[in-house]
Structures are given as C-alpha cells and as structure tokens.
C-alpha cells in the first residue's frame, strides 16, 4: 500500500518528499558535531549532548522532546589505580606489564576523559596463575579443550581472542570452566584486514588498539539491580551479590602487541588445528603455562574497576499522529560511546538526527504522520542496553498495547560493501519494496536499485534471487522491544563483504581510533552510504507510520515458521533412537505451522478485499497485524531467561549477537547426548515442542476472523 494517501497533506508530502529532504552533508555535519569529545554513559559530557539533542529536536519541529532519566549500575576504571596485566617471575617481580592506555590518535592528544580500555563490570581482583589459550572461548572451544584435549581450565587464567561471539558469552564460558581470570585480546587474524594500513593511515587496528566492552550476561534484564522494573527514584535495588548477570572473575582487554608478549611464551599442548591459530608470530600453544625456560613465570591481573549507580538520560521525541495517535512507531538508537564513537554509535545517531530534521520539515509545512512516531536517543547501551530497557520497562503497558514497530539505529556502517538487514518476517515485504524504490550507492550499480545491488552482493542462502535478511539476535537496543515485548522490529546498516573480510565486526570497534576521520577518510567520504541507510531506516519508519494498512505480511511468517520447524526437526532427528525411546513427536508443531499457513493466507485474502473506508474494520485488521508479533510472546519466558519471551526467536545462548529460531527447543536439544539424565532431558524437549506448537497455533488464531 503506497503512502501517497498520507493524512491531511498536499500530494507532495509523500515518501518522496521525506526522502528528498535527507541530505548527506547534514549527516556528515552531525557526525562531526557528535564525535569531538567522548560521550561515555553516566558522564557530564553525555548529559550535555542529551540536552543538545533535546534542544535541536525541538527546533526541528517535534511536538515534544523530554529527557527520561534512570539511576543504573555502571562500571568505571579507578582513575588512580589503573588496570593492567603482568608477567611475574618466581620472586613475584613484574617483568612485563601491559599498556595502561591506547596511544591517542593524531589531533586528539589533548582530549581529556578518554576512558582507558577495560571490561565493564569486571569485579576487582589480582589473580595470578598459569595461562591457557582458549581460542575464541566459544562453547565449542571449551568442548575441544576439556573433552578432546583433556585440558582443565580450573584455577587458570584464560586468554581468548575477540570475535565470533559476544564477549559476555566468552566470560560466562570461562567461568563455567573454572577459570579465575580472563584476558581478551584482538588478534590481527580477526581485526587486521590484509592489504590495509593501520589507523591513522587506514582502517585497520594498530597493535596498541584495544576493544572495550561490557561482559555482562543480562539476558535482557536491563539494569542489573532492578530487573523487570524501571530504575527510577523509588526503585528497590538488589544487593550487588544478587545483581543480574555480573561476572564473578576479573576480566581485562589488551591489544595484539601486548598479547604477543603473553602468547609467545606459551607451552603445553599445541593448537588442536589451524582454526586455533591467529596471525601473530607465536605458536598458539594452548598451555597450560609457559614453555621451558619461562615455566616458573606466571601471569597476574590487576583489576580495580568499580561498579557505581549512576544517572543516565534518554531523549524521547514525539511527533503526534493525526489519525491514530495511540499507535506508536519508534525509531531509536543510542548516544553513549566508549570514546569518540565515530562509528558506534554516532554514525547512527547522525542519521537519526537527519531523519528527525526531515520529518520536522514536513511537519512545519502542515503534514503529520497517520500514526505517532517516537524518536529515542538511548543512553548506556554500551553498558548492557540499559537506557532502552529501563524506558521500555517504565512504559511497558503503553508499548504492549500501542507499539506498532521499532526500528533500531545504532552504527549506520560497519563496512561499505552492501546493505545488511535483520528484521521480523513481518517486515520482509516492506524492506523488499522499499529497497526496490531506492537508488543503489554502490560503484558499478549506477542507475540500479538498492535491492538489485544488495541481492547481487548478499544473496539469500535459501531463496535464490532474493537478498539475505537475517534473524534478529541481540546486542542492541531493539532487544527489549522485540525479545521481551513482542513489538515487530528491524535494523539496517551498511556492512562489509563477509566473503573476503573474515575479521569480526570492524577492526577499530570500541577503540580510541573510532573517530570522525575514520569515517570521513576511509569508510564513507561522500557520506553516500550513510544517506542510503538514512533512506532505508527513515523510509521504513515513514511507511510504518503512514500506510493506511500496516505494511506487514503475515504470509512471510508462515514461510519462515516452516523453515524453522524443518530445521529443528532435522536437529532432533540426529537422535533417532532417543526420539523413539522417549516418544518425541513434532506432529503438533508441524500441524500448528500448517494451520498458521492456512489462516495467514485467508487473512491476507481478507486484507485485500475489505472496505478500507470503514475506520472500524480498518483498525480491526491493523490491530490483528500489530498484535501478531505480540502473539509469539510467552509470558513465562524461556527457561532461565525470563526476559527473553519470544518463542520463535531469541538471542543464542552461545552468542548474544546471533538469533536462534525455536530457541526453547534448540536449547533443550543442545548437547543432549551429554546430559546425565536423558529421560529428563528428552522430557524437556517434549515440553518445549508443546510450548512452541501451542504458541504458533495461538498466534494463528489471532489472525482468524474475529467472529
């Protein structure tokens, strides 16, 4: 359904007018403005930026712009007692110490308040012991170490390379393996692309560069002290011992120069295979401990960071809808950064700023969207998605009744190769249709659509002739909206070529070198990719807020539900004997998926035929579409993860960044052959099939004719 039928406007105020108003030069200017000093969550600088954004959004023409503050648990290094790691000899003397800070980039030597590299929420401690190299510290890496190589990490300090999975999962895995400390480092194999120079001469990570980041395992809880409820002025706070998701062992990140010094002395077992070798000139021995001459030397961590309840500020802007003001389309991205935030988050925040300006321009000319649009500048995302989660907890009753969609707007770029989209299946058709109308910014695709370049460069692995659209996982501010509240969500950014660049994320992620110049010199000098991302994000918001019929297609959910059911059944069928022994049947799930398919198609038929001039029927049909995502929410949540309530999707238990389908069944089946009580384990599989089948069937029934 085209948006040209937008409410009480002249014909020129359509999607085209909105898109034409978006300007690359403005995004560039906003990015520069947002990246001149650090904006660490909980600091005065980030509060000042919040007030600046509030003021500018008001100037742009939003109806209201408010600050929403919360007092949440944050973590900072001790300014007078720095964190570091040393190699000590048998007398306890420190014969090598890791660096205390990153060498500042040119032009930033005199900037104050650059937080040194640290692992946020690490407990204090000074453990010492032998080192064990654990590759990426993934579940499968510890399986390899413990089961195949018979290497015990208990009482050891483990060193893991960043990449592949969320760092919090690495720490959790190390804890479960009995480690007493974790050292995280960036290996050039993952953070140094061949043929590219280090910053400031290119976009690669220099040896002194370090990735900061939180190491929580919150599982969607938000503020660790107030899970489920907003951290407001009358909040009851848990004691630190009962806080959600805090690590129990000291953790610290280092760069590859320092990692070289630790790894070059490693002895013990050789790496099990080539997948455990990085690109440093070291043997990548697993350990435990150092080799021959250095066997009496140990590693010692010195961690003195503190956890502090600190005030954070979200900026919430409102553009009231003309026809359905009680239906909310939300565009949100975070404002807080580890240092300058050249990519994360300010390349996203600059795009949001320009989208707000464009909407404001239309509003000043007399236009309003059909539905209300909420714009959010979230705080403390880097500390565990805290700002967005607390606001959603505070407003959960409104959101679950009125929330149409949430579009996330963190980093606009992580490369300049092609588009990357993760979203609910309800938005597939919206994304396809929109990208077919936008021009590709890619070289060699002049005059071609974004859809065409995207499909060519990032084809769907399952469906030929279509672009890849991924499942939503977590690690960003959509989490509470999608995984907890069941609000249809999506995200879009420009990405790298995953085929040729095997490094994880982008090399300078969360380092001091993530500057304005990094973007302007190396990633997007013309800001054309930023503009394209603004068009995609803004275009999605425009359509969601303005289409007479919501641009959701329930038939696409039917397609993926079948695919996911097939996939989880195939995983289960790796255990045919146990399936028989314990009478495990997927019939109920497959039946529910078929019913969903049938009902979704009938609903789509009615959607094409109903009288759109009847406001009651229109609202009824739109509500069925809006509430479909909500219907996949189980109020009881997933086992041991009460804030992950979506039955079809959840962040992987092994990698927060990745999405898993039918996560309840998947987790019940995971490593089931090693469970001590197979009867109980397969009983849980059966229970999860039951929950999934019931949920899919219940969701299908929400699409049935109402009477």
């Amino acid at each position: 359904k085209s948006s040209n039928e937008a409410t009480n406007i002249t014909p020129k105020h359509n999607m085209k007018a909105f898109l034409d108003e978006l300007k690359a030069e403005n995004i560039k200017k906003f990015l520069y403005n947002f990246t001149q000093i650090p904006h660490l969550a909980g600091t005065e600088q980030n509060f000042q930026l919040a007030k600046q954004i509030q003021s500018q959004w008001k100037e742009f023409g939003l109806d209201s712009v408010e600050l929403a503050h919360y007092d949440v648990l944050l973590s900072y290094p001790n300014k007078t007692h720095p964190n570091y790691i040393s190699i000590i000899n048998e007398d306890g003397n420190e014969i090598f110490n890791t660096s205390l800070f990153e060498p500042p980039p040119p032009g930033y030597e005199n900037v104050s308040d650059i937080v040194p590299p640290f692992s946020a929420f690490s407990p204090q401690g000074m453990p010492e012991g032998d080192l064990v190299y654990v590759n990426y510290a993934r579940t499968e890496d510890f399986f390899k170490l413990e089961r195949d190589m018979k290497i015990n990490c208990s009482g050891k300090i483990v060193i893991a390379r960043y990449g592949k999975v969320f760092r919090g999962n690495k720490v959790k895995n190390a804890q479960l393996a009995g480690a007493k400390g974790v050292i995280l480092y960036s290996d050039p194999a993952d953070y140094f692309a061949p043929g590219v120079k280090s910053y400031p001469d290119g976009w690669n990570l220099p040896g002194g560069g370090v990735q900061r980041g939180n190491i929580l395992n919150l599982n969607g809880a938000g503020d660790p002290l107030t899970p489920g409820y907003p951290a407001n002025e009358y909040a009851y706070r848990r004691g630190i011992a009962e806080a959600v998701g805090l690590p129990s062992i000291p953790v610290h990140p280092i760069g590859y120069y320092d990692a070289q010094k630790l790894l070059e002395k490693m002895g013990g077992s050789a790496p099990p295979d080539s997948s455990w070798r990085g690109s440093l000139k070291v043997p990548y021995n697993v350990g435990p401990g150092f080799t021959g001459n250095f066997s009496t030397q140990k590693v010692k961590m010195h961690i003195h960071s503190t956890n502090e309840v600190t005030r954070i500020y979200n900026v919430i802007g409102t553009l009231r809808g003309a026809v359905e003001p009680d239906r909310y389309v939300i565009l949100g991205g975070h404002r807080d950064s580890w240092v300058f935030g050249g990519i994360d988050p300010q390349s996203g925040a600059a795009v949001v700023h320009e989208i707000v300006r464009s909407f404001g321009t239309l509003k000043k000319e007399g236009w309003r969207p059909r539905r209300t649009i909420l714009f959010a500048s979230w705080d403390a995302e880097e500390f565990g998605l805290l700002g967005s989660t607390e606001w959603a907890e505070e407003n959960s009753r409104l959101l679950q009744e009125r929330g149409v969609a949430y579009i996330n707007a963190d980093s606009s770029i992580e490369g300049n190769y092609t588009l990357r989209v993760d979203c609910t299946p309800l938005m597939y058709s919206l994304v396809h249709n929109l990208t077919k109308e936008l021009k590709s910014p890619d070289e060699g695709f002049e005059g071609k659509s974004l859809y065409e370049s995207w499909t060519k460069k990032s084809p769907s692995p399952e469906f030929s002739g279509m672009p890849r659209i991924s499942k939503l996982g977590s690690g960003n501010d959509f989490e509470v909206f999608f995984q907890r509240l069941g609000i249809a969500s999506g995200r879009a950014r420009y990405t790298k070529n995953w085929e040729t660049n095997k490094f994880s994320g982008y090399p300078l992620y969360h380092s001091v070198y993530e500057t304005y110049e990094l973007v302007e010199k190396f990633y997007d000098p013309m800001f054309k990719y930023h503009l394209t991302v603004a068009q995609v994000r803004g275009g999605m918001v425009f359509e969601l807020a303005n289409s007479i019929v919501l641009p959701f297609d329930c038939r696409d959910y039917a397609v993926v539900l079948r695919k996911y059911a097939d996939k989880i059944y195939s995983i289960s069928m790796k255990h045919p004997q146990e399936m028989k022994t314990y009478s495990v049947s997927f019939d109920s799930l497959f039946s529910a998926v078929k019913n969903f398919t049938e009902i979704a198609s009938k609903f789509s038929e009615r959607l094409q035929d109903f009288d759109k001039s009847n406001p009651i029927v229109l609202r009824m049909m739109n509500d069925q579409l809006m509430f479909l995502e909500r219907a996949f929410i189980d109020p009881l949540g997933l086992p041991d993860r009460p804030f992950y309530r979506h039955v079809i999707y959840a962040p992987s238990s092994h990698n927060k960044y990745a999405g898993e389908s039918f996560p309840g069944i998947y987790d019940a089946l995971f490593d089931i052959e090693s469970k001590v009580d197979p009867s109980k384990a397969w009983g849980e599989v059966k229970r999860q099939i039951y929950v999934a089948a019931f949920t899919v069937q219940a969701a299908a029934e929400t699409l049935s004719e109402v009477a």
Partner: antibody
Framework: EVQLVESGGGLVQPGGSLRLSCAAS????????MSWVRQAPGKGLEWVSA????????YYADSVKGRFTISRDNSKNTLWLQMNSLRAEDTAVYYC??????????????WGQGTLVTVSS | QSVLTQPPSVSAAPGQKVTISCSGS????????VSWYQQLPGTAPKLLIY???KRPSGIPDRFSGSKSGTSATLGITGLQTGDEADYYC???????????FGGGTKLTVL
C-alpha cells in the same frame, strides 16, 4: 472457479532457453504458493520448483537448481518459469499447480492442463 | 529414482478393494502431510487425498488415505473401470526443502 492456463512450451535446442507462463484466475493469487511440476513422456511426476506467497521465497529441485528461475507477478496473477541451459532430459509436459493451504507448498489442489517442452537438436 | 517408493502397478477386479503403498523416510512422510493424486490417461493430475486422509469435495468416499510412521496408503473400494489411472503420492521433504513424489502406481481394473 479456479483456472490455471500454461503457455510458452515448444521445441528448443539443447543449451537453449524457454519461458513458461501460467495465467491464474478464480482465487487470491498472491496468498498461495505456486509450483511447477513436470512429467517426462511415459514417466512419473517430478516437482520442479515452487514460489511462496508473500515476498515469493523460492524452492528448486536439485536437477534444475542454477538453470531454472521461478517468479511471479501478483498484480498480473501470473507465474513464470525461466528455463536456461536446457537439456534433453528436461523434455516433459510442464504443469502449473496451486497450493491448497497457503504460502508454502503442502499439496496441489488445482493443476493446469500442461504445456509440452521438447529439448532436441 | 523417486524419493518416495510406490509399487509400479496394482490390479483388481471391478467391485474389489485395492491399496497402494507409499514408503518414505522420517524427513518426508514421517513428519509431513501426504497427498494423493489421480492421473487419468492424457489428463492433468487431480487431487484425491490431502492431509493424509482428507478428501476434497467431489471425491467419493470410496477413496481413503492413511499414514503410519514413514509409510502412507491409498485405499480404493468398489473399484470401477473409470478408476484405471496412475496414482501418485506426494509430500514435503524437510531435509531437502522440496516437494517429493512417488514414482507412481498404475492401477488396472481387470
């Protein structure tokens, strides 16, 4: 009443291309998965390809993957099969079939009359 | 070689009963719904049974379907000469992400 009418068959040389069409009427075309099923002379039915309702996710038999492309135009109620790099073993009557459930293939409740494709030099 | 296995032919006298078997695996018949099609000589196939055992309107109750484990069966009672045709079973295969058919069974009414 539901009607499916195939066209575009004919004689083509090995390595050549052909585009089959299927004009649909009598139902809400966009809501249903559509398939192509073929039958070589004197042989059984062989499913070739399907396209879902909604955005049109595609599925192919291994024997045609990379050579055939299924597509649909919901505004025109038309299904297509673009056949490239044709081989002698692709000779068959090609049927267009509608799914009886919805957006993904379950069973075929309506079939076209078929169009003959002959690949021969 | 078809993914689903059917007998190439069956025969019976008019008025008799006949069954046609269709054997598959856990990834197709074992978990998915089976349908049956009748193809009279020189015509397009016609849906006979869907969802293992349901008949579309217009199909007489002489035709029945059943499924057990990884096999399905089509039953025809009160055979008539007009039933002479090829019969195909079909289903989805969850591993292949594809529709699969049996090789077909030729029914001869003696």
């Amino acid at each position: 009443e539901v009607q499916l009418v195939e066209s575009g068959g004919g004689l083509v040389q090995p390595g050549g291309s052909l585009r089959l069409s299927c004009a649909a009427s009598g139902f809400t075309f966009s809501s249903y998965a559509m398939s192509w099923v073929r039958q070589a002379p004197g042989k059984g039915l062989e499913w070739v390809s399907a396209i879902s309702g909604g955005i049109g996710s595609t599925y192919y038999a291994d024997s045609v993957k990379g050579r055939f492309t299924i597509s649909r135009d919901n505004s025109k109620n038309t299904l297509w099969l673009q056949m490239n790099s044709l081989r002698a073993e692709d000779t068959a009557v090609y049927y267009c079939a509608k799914d009886g459930v919805g957006a993904t293939p379950y069973y075929f409740d309506y079939w076209g009359q078929g169009t003959l494709v002959t690949v021969s030099s | 070689q078809s993914v689903l296995t059917q007998p190439p032919s069956v025969s019976a006298a008019p008025g008799q009963k006949v069954t046609i078997s269709c054997s598959g695996s856990s990834s197709n018949i074992g978990i998915n719904y089976v349908s049956w099609y009748q193809q009279l000589p020189g015509t397009a196939p016609k849906l006979l049974i869907y969802d293992n055992n349901k008949r579309p309107s217009g199909i007489p109750d002489r035709f029945s379907g059943s499924k057990s484990g990884t096999s399905a069966t089509l039953g025809i009672t009160g055979l008539q000469t007009g039933d002479e045709a090829d019969y195909y079973c079909g289903t989805w295969d969850s591993s292949l992400s594809a529709v699969v058919f049996g090789g077909g069974t030729k029914l001869t009414v003696l």
